[in-house]
Amino acid sequence: TLNSVLNSNAIKNLPPPLGGAAGHPGSAVSAAPGILYPGGNKYQTIDNYQPYPCAEDEECGTDEYCASPTRGGDAGVQICLACRKRRKRCMRHAMCCPGNYCKNGICVSSDQNHFRGEIEETITESFGNDHSTLDGYSRRTTLSSKMYHTKGQEGSVCLRSSDCASGLCCARHFWSKICKPVLKEGQVCTKHRRKGSHGLEIFQRCYCGEGLSCRIQKDHHQASNSSRLHTCQRH
């Protein structure tokens, strides 16, 4: 369960804490490639890669979904798998890569006036970390949003990127997900070096926008692995 994945407070894969971000020496802040919260996941190492176990899609990255690694495999053993690109087979929306949804068993572009009708989802925040509303009211939240003509604006709670308006994706913000802007050219992006090494990002970034990919910044090739800065660049 997500609860068991979130039972540790260690933060991994962070940039150097002092002296600014790679490529920005002396700045008073560091640009972190995503603030990570790995949870108590013994599989999660970079050098000794193993698949990232999961119980539901929301535990995986924005470009992954949760499923059994083999067709007809043991449903009790699920890992985060790479999302399916356009025109690939699917069984549900979460299997399709951001910007797509599952229609008639095939991943198709969500640009084609796809609206999910109504989301009725109850989130009970019973993780290892305490969640309190600032005004002290109930911690049980019901999302009920009609999606016929309006999609989530920036900062709106979402379940997946298809819930967000154009130019936004659904990304983790603490232990929820909200609509954030898709990254533009030159913006810092998160490059997970090996699938499963990323943990759960507390402050997750969106993916790079159309025609862009997340690549190491050219002038950072000499930097150490841990401090390399990735940015959205033209293909």
Epitope: A32, H131, T133, F174, S176, V188, F203
Partner: nanobody, 117 residues
């Protein structure tokens, strides 16, 4: 350019209190929320507490629940961490970080908190 500056750290006896502040300057865009993290010598950085302006919620690690309180003012770009009933194991460098709408995640340089027994 955004700068996050932490202050309020120091040496305190076990059972004592400290109040940390983190001020953001140079921001021309909004923040979704801010968090406090800490790193003790030889250990990994860990989440301590967070506040979401967007969702109106606060978050705490189990180890500090009931002892630490996070608060802040988004309009003033400031977040605070009130630390009571401090323990020697709270000794660490405390960092604040911000979830920014320009897609950067900003870190401060940290403030040292030392709790003596």
């Amino acid at each position: 350019e955004v700068q996050l500056v932490e202050s309020g750290g120091g040496l305190v006896q076990a059972g004592g209190s400290l109040r940390l502040s983190c001020a953001a300057s140079g921001r021309t865009f909004s923040s979704y929320g801010m968090g406090w993290f800490r790193q003790a010598p030889g250990k990994e950085r860990e989440f301590v507490a967070g506040i979401s302006w967007t969702l109106g919620r606060t978050y705490y690690a189990d180890s500090v629940k009931g002892r630490f309180t996070i608060s802040g003012d988004n309009a003033k770009n400031t977040v605070y961490l009130q630390m009571n009933s401090l323990k020697p194991e709270d000794t660490a460098i405390y960092y604040c970080a911000s979830d920014e709408s320009d897609a950067y995640n900003y870190w401060g340089q940290g403030t040292q908190v030392t709790v003596s027994s």
